[in-house]
């Protein structure tokens, strides 16, 4: 198996995905192992308020997706907060985005049938130097 230019050694016991009997679907246990972990990022830390590029957290709920609740960050300011507590527009607040895998109900509204899907979520914001376009 070659992935991203790296050869991954293959276990001879692996099933052959070309085999007509190879399953196209898998069983997934949706009982989360560490369910006690606090899933509300507002409660787990206050970085969203203390950051020099603070953000608001929004509960994104979609019953057709697992997990159904994902918290999305949206930057509060165009600039960043300076030492005086004012917004400095010499810098930009931008979201930190992470691609994650979720399960989407397929067909829709089916309780036990899902398709794997990649989505992009904003997990927080950071402060960057802005891109300056020079006009001729």
């Amino acid at each position: 198996i070659v992935k991203a230019g790296i050869t991954i050694p293959r276990n001879p016991g692996c099933p052959n995905s070309e085999d007509k009997n190879f399953p196209r679907t898998v069983m997934v246990n949706l009982n989360i192992h560490n369910r006690n972990t606090n899933t509300n990022p507002k409660r787990s830390s206050d970085y969203y308020n203390r950051s020099t590029s603070p953000w608001n957290l929004h509960r994104n709920e979609d019953p057709e997706r697992y997990p159904s609740v994902i918290w999305e960050a949206k930057c509060r300011h165009l600039g960043c907060i300076n030492a005086d507590g004012n917004v400095d527009y010499h810098m930009n607040s931008v979201p930190i985005q992470q691609e994650i895998l979720v399960l989407r109900r397929e067909p829709p509204h089916c309780p036990n049938s899902f398709r794997l899907e990649k989505i992009l979520v904003s997990v927080g914001c950071t402060c960057v130097t802005p891109i300056v376009h020079h006009v001729a």
């Epitope: 929004h58 999305e72 949206k74 300011h77 165009l78 527009y89 979201p95």
Partner: antibody, heavy 124, light 111 residues
Framework: EVQLLESGGGLVQPGGSLRLSCAAS????????MFWVRQAPGKGLEWVSS????????YYADSVKGRFTISRDNSKNTLYLQMNSLRAEDTAVYYC?????????????????WGQGTTVTVSS | QYELTQPHSVSESPGKTVTISCTRS????????VQWYRQRPGSAPIIVIY?????PSGVPDRFSGSIDTSSNSASLTISGLKTEDEADYYC??????????FGGGTKLTVL
């Protein structure tokens, strides 16, 4: 009453210049982001330019970059748009608008107060 | 930079519910706030929804906003349609470099 009143529109030849003004009243002008938005005849809204409360930073649509300059005089509660090298496609109603907020005042919460607009016609 | 696409026109009868969509071409619809504006002929726009789903004071609760990550779109829903709701509706968002974007607008006709 919170109000924005644009002026300075008119008929100008291609390549000409025009300066639009927007007089603000009823709120603390120096605390708010301000915008210029235009609407060509029969077309949709198009963002033109924005300016931060202090006036120190400005932002422009690619279509006007290098030709238009936004500025403000917080002591006079007035927003300006200097338009140079005007083209036929700049013909539009020009609106000035205020960003929603403070206290949450930021760039990202929409434009909650709009002027009535001033018409700019670029034609020979 | 992304684009916001709206249907050119929608129509519905008085008393019914209508939904206007605003689809983002790239990046997640949830990454940036979406605003909605109403513009009646010959008048300036007014904001009817800000921060995805917040209603300014004075806007009736018949107006609601939402975002849907599966279709990567925002929606404006108007229930109990009235003839006075007939107008052009624009969605708007921004990118983090300071650019403000508007959708092409949707003409709502109340039959």
């Amino acid at each position: 009453e919170v109000q924005l009143l644009e002026s300075g529109g008119g008929l100008v030849q291609p390549g000409g210049s025009l300066r639009l003004s927007c007089a603000a009243s009823g709120f603390t002008f120096s605390k708010y982001f301000m915008f210029w938005v235009r609407q060509a005849p029969g077309k949709g809204l198009e963002w033109v330019s924005s300016i931060v409360p202090s006036g120190g930073h400005t932002y422009y649509a690619d279509s006007v970059k290098g030709r238009f300059t936004i500025s403000r005089d917080n002591s006079k509660n007035t927003l300006y748009l200097q338009m140079n090298s005007l083209r036929a496609e700049d013909t539009a109603v020009y609106y000035c608008a205020r960003a929603k907020g403070p206290p949450r005042g930021s760039y990202y919460y929409g434009m909650d107060v709009w002027g009535q607009g001033t018409t700019v016609t670029v034609s020979s | 930079q992304y684009e916001l696409t709206q249907p050119h026109s929608v129509s519905e009868s008085p008393g019914k519910t209508v939904t206007i969509s605003c689809t983002r071409s790239s990046g997640s619809i949830a990454s940036n706030y979406v605003q909605w504006y109403r513009q009646r002929p010959g008048s300036a726009p007014i904001i009817v929804i800000y921060e995805d789903n917040q209603r300014p004071s004075g806007v009736p609760d018949r107006f609601s906003g939402s975002i849907d990550t599966s279709s990567n779109s925002a929606s404006l829903t108007i229930s109990g349609l009235k003839t006075e709701d007939e107008a052009d509706y624009y969605c708007s968002s921004y990118d983090y470099s300071g650019t403000v974007l508007f959708g092409g607008g949707t003409k709502l006709t109340v039959l």
